[in-house]
Amino acid sequence: MDSLGAVSTRLGFDLFKELKKTNDGNIFFSPVGILTAIGMVLLGTRGATASQLEEVFHSEKETKSSRIKAEEKEVIENTEAVHQQFQKFLTEISKLTNDYELNITNRLFGEKTYLFLQKYLDYVEKYYHASLEPVDFVNAADESRKKINSWVESKTNEKIKDLFPDGSISSSTKLVLVNMVYFKGQWDREFKKENTKEEKFWMNKSTSKSVQMMTQSHSFSFTFLEDLQAKILGIPYKNNDLSMFVLLPNDIDGLEKIIDKISPEKLVEWTSPGHMEERKVNLHLPRFEVEDGYDLEAVLAAMGMGDAFSEHKADYSGMSSGSGLYAQKFLHSSFVAVTEEGTEAAAATGIGFTVTSAPGHENVHCNHPFLFFIRHNESNSILFFGRFSSP
């Protein structure tokens, strides 16, 4: 299989393009979070359903050649590598929690009387650190809905409420998958709160909204993309475990024009250490909290994973030998808070902030729509991918 870094970048960008078709405003999701949920489904699917999901984890080239003729045994071994990679990644991520509030949580909510393969439930726990919660969909669908919502709320410090709206769960529901990613990080260098000022954020050339604009002047990884007329900036989080990358077009309405010129491969290349260089940057970044939830069945089906969400095509025989099981609901929700908080600069360094544009300083003024993603540097996995276009 491809590395989690490559897979999450590819899925992140492909999913972004899919979500963009029906979303004008902010888009925000966790590619790696969604991948863990896909992995959990893959674990329980067989046949064509599994093959469709498996393709997410392989590059086009690999899929088209050797894998098509792969024997069943080889496919199973490949699949195991996928799950082992997630096990390793989730273990690594859990070690970061002293410095960050970072939770990647998967939970299956299963009809309490429905029969599941014991082996599947054991594996889900082993590889995905996920548990299965029994709920009474049959006799208490709405109560079950509320139970799931309050669990989500508790896992996100009350930031994500009513993930499942009224009527979204019925008595015929057998299985609900919830993937949730919550992140509140500390920058490697804090933004001084006293430098945060109210400023206009231009959604387009004629419409603006007020934002709290954080500012700092420091050395950052930077690259200028001449053909795209855009800048990329890397902002490290504490201990450099994670970084946020901002892709800011020069023009207010430049983002739409350049999206088609971006590919997952280019994103990886542009943000690689060899491509970016340390530059002094005057950075202006809005303080923002984004929370987004997506019902992923239709979106993933549009991306070629339709069988898993089709009552008539789904093969979940690795999860249950009872017929008719499929993921009726696959909800992904993510939350990130971008605030001033970070490691306080030691007084001795005495970095003062000047608003004037000093010679040799790059200006990265995020006061119009930009793309951003948060990367786990050790695995190169994309924790979050988003478009900030509307405060």
Epitope: K112, Y114, L115, F116, Q118, K119, S321
Partner: antibody, heavy 132, light 107 residues
Framework: QMQLVQSGGGVVRPGGSLRLSCAAS????????MSWVRQAPGKGLEWVSG????????GYADSVKGRFTISRDNAKNSLYLQMNSLRAEDTALYYC?????????????????????????WGQGTLVTVSS | ETTLTQSPGTLSLSPGERATLSCRAS???????LAWYQQKPGQPPRLLIY???SRATGIPDRFSGSGSGTDFTLTISRLEPEDFAVYYC????????FGQGTKVELK
């Protein structure tokens, strides 16, 4: 087709040991938990011991705890019951039985071997006689 | 530990007749995890019913199970010659205990 072929029974003196085997074929052995169930001559059925699909979890009836050990070798598609310190009351026909691979969420969380799982296929049985 | 009491001990009937077998638990069988097995002389038991009322694969529809809580019933709507055997109920929801059996014999 699905088969559970048993071996290892025989006559043994009280205090002696015996190892029963059960060779499985016709299904994916490591998808299933397995159990041993016994039946004393002319009597009813008694669950003896169970093991989950990967051997990570085992359970025993109070009457055999500390004397019997259940194990499995998934590579060989085989189930075993090591019986030590045998007593006259252990005399019975011993069956290996495949547990249903399915469990409800509720019973799965109880984490007890064999709980929530019926026995959908049985071996032909092997007789163990403990007599002096 | 749950004790299962089956009644009657023996049921003498003719082919074509209806057989009603009872199984009473000393405490509630959790989740209706009650199974019924059939055993003929010299043969291992065969699963008939699981979950109190679901027929196992290949079991004819003349066999049906019902009940919940502490009272369960196995019904054979029309006895066939091959149905004469001993029937056991089993609580597999907590204690994995079996009842003592009901023998259905030819009258």
């Amino acid at each position: 087709q699905m088969q559970l072929v048993q071996s290892g029974g025989g006559v043994v003196r009280p205090g002696g040991s015996l190892r029963l085997s059960c060779a499985a074929s016709g299904f994916t052995f490591d998808d299933y938990g397995m159990s041993w169930v016994r039946q004393a001559p002319g009597k009813g059925l008694e669950w003896v011991s169970g093991i989950n699909w990967n051997g990570g979890s085992t359970g025993y009836a109070d009457s055999v705890k500390g004397r019997f050990t259940i194990s499995r070798d998934n590579a060989k598609n085989s189930l075993y019951l090591q019986m030590n310190s045998l007593r006259a009351e252990d005399t019975a026909l011993y069956y290996c039985a495949r547990e249903s691979s399915m469990t409800t969420v509720t019973t799965y969380l109880l984490r007890e071997v064999g709980v929530g799982l019926d026995f959908d296929y049985w071996g032909q049985g092997t007789l163990v006689t403990v007599s002096s | 530990e749950t004790t299962l009491t089956q009644s009657p001990g023996t049921l003498s009937l003719s082919p074509g007749e209806r057989a009603t077998l009872s199984c009473r638990a000393s405490q509630t069988v959790s989740g209706s995890y009650l199974a019924w097995y059939q055993q003929k002389p010299g043969q291992p038991p065969r699963l008939l019913i699981y979950g109190a009322s679901s027929r196992a694969t290949g079991i004819p529809d003349r066999f049906s199970g019902s009940g919940s809580g502490t009272d369960f019933t196995l019904t054979i709507s029309r006895l066939e010659p091959e149905d004469f055997a001993v029937y056991y109920c089993q609580d597999y929801g907590s204690s994995r205990t079996f009842g003592q059996g009901t023998k259905v014999e030819l009258k």
